[in-house]
């Protein structure tokens, strides 16, 4: 007998469990940047500190009537969703509220920046336990707001932001577009994207995951025991902030990268109907609904990976796309995808001491995406081996020649523009285990890693008949680190990873032209981490 | 997620004709001016001046003061509303948009962003 949203995000085995840090006290603090709140509400009294921070613009309109309960409505509801006594996700968590939104729910980028700086100052003056910052607000893309989020995240603060309610690409909004924040879209009781009037939840590659955000019952500022239902990506973000608070309460040393990877790994997969999103955004939008993950003690040693898409390169001839992992993550592979199929491949290069995944558009192409596979590999030592393009008709082989290094990904980049000339690359696990094999005019890049107990293998699946895509999945206990398409005669659009599934896409028009003898193959590199074992290549 | 989205970036790197100050004439702006792509969300007249990452505390204050001085020379009054030290070096200023070209040529300035609205979601 609990509301749908709490049932959805908190698995049955967690329902009665109270999360406490090892010393018995819940030291996580959540900072809420929102409207004013009603601190005396039964849901949050004694748990909330209303700071004296107030940086809001004047309300619009000469006849605006400032009514306290309306001014407090949004913030009170969210405070209740995060840490409410009864309707909260992280019931005991202490919360600090900063007023950056006025009675009409409007604020400014500058006010938000001053609020974030206030948190940083508080952190410097009185260092405490883990901090979570909830940003249930959105404005247009702002370089400085994203930069401020990056700076705060690098001090160890976990920021959670609303994706936005504009039924649009979340990358066009801030702070939703900041890579260092956990960006949350909204789903309803049927696990479908939330519609809000003519608009709805934002989507796209800048969304990390979705969470309940429709008809969420929480504290109402109308009275100190009142409840009401509210909807939006703010509510969704508040659920994730609550989950993060609970995770940190159990394990205060979890980093942002670990938190994000665990949220993604343990979320409910493939329940969202992607048809709700614009067609060009469907492949970029994560099909993930948040749930409270078990602790690392219960699930230790798993290799956790996520897929990071770049921005679209744009259509110019030399346009490149760049996908980056978080500083703590290892880039284990890089692939590319183009809707037109006109791409010149992908490669990994070091920029400012960090490995990045790059993809290059081809002449006449509408643009490409770079697709990075970003993983948490404790004590990893990874390097890239590349071989320049072979002479016409010759194969290029690249393997991991350092001792105890295993192949985690392959990338291929063609020097030639003419797609008809080149024979696309192949990855042959049976003939040459642990090698990337390129063909005519392709530079080949092998991503090689050494980490305690890391073992990898290639898994291939080919389809000869007409098919828009070929997929291959890593089996339970293994994690997908690399994904490539090994084509037959047809033009391929590229390959990308969706959770543990490697998806190779083939050009629509090519399906009819295909001869049955030439299969399109999806090649996955699957790895696992067994801390006691030596690094090895599994044939 | 880190590329600039649907965002207006304008170069206002015009060398000043009217200012005879040697250091200013020598400094051609490489800084950019940015503002929200949604016109209705913009707050013209309020700007966040973002300085280079390594700018020291004293230099932030000097840059803000220098902008005030140079604006005054042109007959403009500007108001520094807030100085950012802890998350990034910079300051928030209320001024006429006429002064953007001048501000972009100040030493240490990386970019200037026009303030804009954010909304409860």
């Amino acid at each position: 007998s609990i509301p749908w949203n709490l049932e959805r995000i908190i698995p049955a085995w967690h329902q009665t469990e109270e999360d406490r840090s090892p010393d018995g006290s819940s030291q996580v603090e959540v900072y809420l940047l929102d409207t004013s709140i009603q601190g005396a509400h039964r849901e949050i009294e004694g748990r909330v500190t209303i700071t004296d921070f107030n940086s809001v613009p004047e309300e619009d309109g000469t006849r605006f009537h400032r009514q306290a309960s309306k001014c407090d409505s949004h913030g009170t509801h969210l405070a209740g969703v995060v840490s409410g006594r009864d309707a909260g996700v992280a019931k005991g968590t202490s919360l600090h509220s900063l007023r950056v939104l006025n009675c009409q729910g409007k604020g400014t980028v500058s006010g938000t920046l001053i609020g974030l700086e206030f948190i940083r100052k508080s952190q410097l003056i009185q260092p405490s336990g883990p901090l979570v910052v909830l940003l249930p607000l959105a404005g247009g893309y702002s370089r400085i707001l994203n930069a401020a989020c990056r700076h705060l995240a690098r001090t160890g603060v976990v920021l959670v932001a609303a994706a936005g309610n504009f039924r649009d690409d979340a990358c066009l909004y801030s702070p939703a577009s900041a890579p260092e924040v956990i960006t949350v879209g909204a789903t309803n009781a049927q696990d479908q994207p939330v519609t809000l009037g003519t608009l709805g939840t934002n989507f796209g590659r800048c969304v990390d995951l979705f969470a309940p955000g429709k008809d969420i019952i929480g504290a109402s500022s109308d009275c100190s025991t009142c409840f009401m239902s509210q909807s939006g990506t703010s509510q969704a973000a508040a659920h994730v902030a609550g989950i993060v608070a609970r995770m940190l309460s159990r394990e205060p040393t979890l980093t942002l990268a670990e938190l994000r990877q665990r949220l993604i790994h343990f979320s409910t997969k493939d329940v969202i109907n992607m048809a709700w999103f614009p067609e060009d955004q469907q492949v970029l939008t994560p099909n993930l609904v948040a749930t409270l993950p078990p602790s690392t003690h219960e699930t230790g040693g798993q290799l956790l990976c996520r897929t990071v898409w770049s921005a679209h390169s744009g259509p110019t001839r030399t346009a490149t796309a760049t996908a980056r992992c978080a500083p703590e993550e290892e880039l284990l592979s890089c692939s590319s995808f183009s809707r037109s199929g006109r791409r010149r491949g992908d490669w990994i290069e070091a920029i400012g001491g960090q490995q990045v995944c790059k993809a290059l558009n081809a002449f006449g192409g509408e643009g490409v995406y770079a697709v990075a596979r970003c993983c948490l590999v404790p004590r990893a030592n990874c390097s890239i081996h590349n071989t320049p393009a072979a002479r016409a008709g010759l194969e290029t082989h690249v393997h991991c020649h350092q001792k105890d290094h295993v192949l985690t990904g392959c990338s291929f980049h063609w020097e030639v523009e003419d797609l008809s000339v080149r024979r696309q690359p192949a990855l042959r696990s049976r003939r040459q285990p642990g090698q990337c094999v390129g063909h005519q005019a392709a530079s080949v890049y092998a991503s090689c890693c050494h980490a305690p107990g890391l073992e990898c293998k290639i898994k291939e699946h080919g389809i000869s008949g007409p098919s828009e895509q070929v997929t291959v999945a890593c089996e339970a206990g293994w994690t997908l680190t690399g994904c490539n398409v090994l084509p037959g005669a047809s033009l391929t659009l590229g390959a990308y990873s969706v959770d543990n599934l490697c998806v190779a896409r083939v050009h629509d028009t090519a399906r009819a032209d295909r001869t049955s003898g030439e299969a399109t193959v999806a090649a996955a590199i699957c790895c696992r981490s067994r801390p006691s074992a030596k690094a090895s290549w599994v044939q | 997620q880190d590329e600039d989205g649907d965002y207006e970036e304008l170069m206002l790197a015009l060398p000043s004709q009217e200012d005879g100050l040697a250091d200013e004439a020598a400094h051609v702006a490489t800084a950019t001016f940015r503002r929200c792509s949604k016109e209705a969300w913009r707050l013209p007249g309020t700007y966040i001046v973002v300085l280079m990452e390594e700018t020291q505390r004293l230099q932030i204050e000097q840059t803000a003061h220098r902008l005030q001085t140079r604006a005054a020379r042109r007959g403009y009054v500007i108001k520094v509303l807030h100085i950012f030290y802890d998350l990034f070096p910079g300051f928030l200023v209320k001024m006429s948009s006429d002064l953007l070209g001048l501000a972009l040529k100040l030493p240490h300035v990386e970019y200037i962003e026009e303030d804009s609205f954010v909304f409860a979601q």
Epitope: S1, I2, P3, T16, A40, H41, R42, E43, E45, S69, R85, D86, A87, K91, I217, S220, D222, C223, S224, T225, C226, F227, M228, S229 | -
Partner: antibody
Framework: EVQLQQSGPELVKPGASVKISCKAS????????MNWVKQSHGKSLEWIGD????????SYNQKFKGKATLTVDKSSSTAYMELRSLTSEDSAVYYC????????????????WGQGTTLTVSS | DIQMTQTTSSLSASLGDRVTISCSAS??????LNWYQQKPDGTVKLLIY???SLHSGVPSRFSGSGSGTDYSLTISNLEPEDIATYYC?????????FGSGTKLEIK
């Protein structure tokens, strides 16, 4: 039929503690907050606090913090109030009262009341 | 805490009369007000919630009204079983507070 059956009258000495029970029947125990109300002889009603039977979450009237402790036992659909360091001021009739749970968010009242438990503190 | 005041501590009326009991709050409570009936044997029942909503099973002769700080309970046609003490209670702000009660007697 909904019933809140309270434990019988108590006569206790000053300084002692007492635990009053309230057994619920005829409805789903976790669907209602359990409130406790004090009525001193010939006086009005005073709200002591409430408890959510789902998770044991409590709210107290500041006046009774440290005096009253509210608990529930879901398995027996019973709510308890313990009063400690008793003085003659604590002599009163104590009521338990069920009020609509939060996710029925239009319900902010005490629908059902127990018959009351008389507590006498005397040496 | 919000103080609830019932100025009339006792009230005598005849059967069939229309009786109004008033209650005022020390600050605006936005209609977050309930009325309870306590019989001489101590039994307590909810009559009206949220200023004017009749609780299920309560006779329609009971009605409530008011706004801001001033509220009232009306019994349109007094019956013998209505002999009781009536309490108003606010839930706008914690702690919940009750009025001092109005004792209704038959003339």
């Amino acid at each position: 039929e909904v019933q809140l059956q309270q434990s019988g009258p108590e006569l206790v000495k000053p300084g002692a503690s007492v635990k009053i029970s309230c057994k619920a029947s005829g409805y789903t125990f976790t669907d209602y907050y359990m409130n406790w109300v004090k009525q001193s002889h010939g006086k009005s009603l005073e709200w002591i606090g409430d408890i959510n039977p789902n998770n044991g979450g409590t709210s107290y009237n500041q006046k009774f913090k440290g005096k009253a402790t509210l608990t529930v036992d879901k398995s027996s659909s019973t709510a308890y109030m313990e009063l400690r360091s008793l003085t003659s001021e604590d002599s009163a009739v104590y009521y338990c009262a069920g009020g609509g749970i939060y996710y029925r968010y239009d319900r902010n009242y005490f629908d059902y009341w127990g018959q009351g438990t008389t507590l006498t503190v005397s040496s | 805490d919000i103080q609830m005041t019932q100025t009339t501590s006792s009230l005598s009326a005849s059967l069939g009369d229309r009786v109004t009991i008033s209650c005022s709050a020390s600050q605006g409570i936005s209609n977050y007000l309930n009325w309870y009936q306590q019989k001489p044997d101590g039994t307590v029942k909810l009559l009206i919630y949220y200023t004017s909503s009749l609780h299920s099973g309560v006779p329609s002769r009971f009605s409530g009204s008011g706004s801001g700080t001033d509220y009232s309970l009306t019994i349109s046609n007094l019956e013998p079983e209505d002999i009781a003490t009536y309490y108003c209670q606010q839930y706008s702000k914690l702690p919940f507070t009750f009025g001092s009660g109005t004792k209704l007697e038959i003339k």
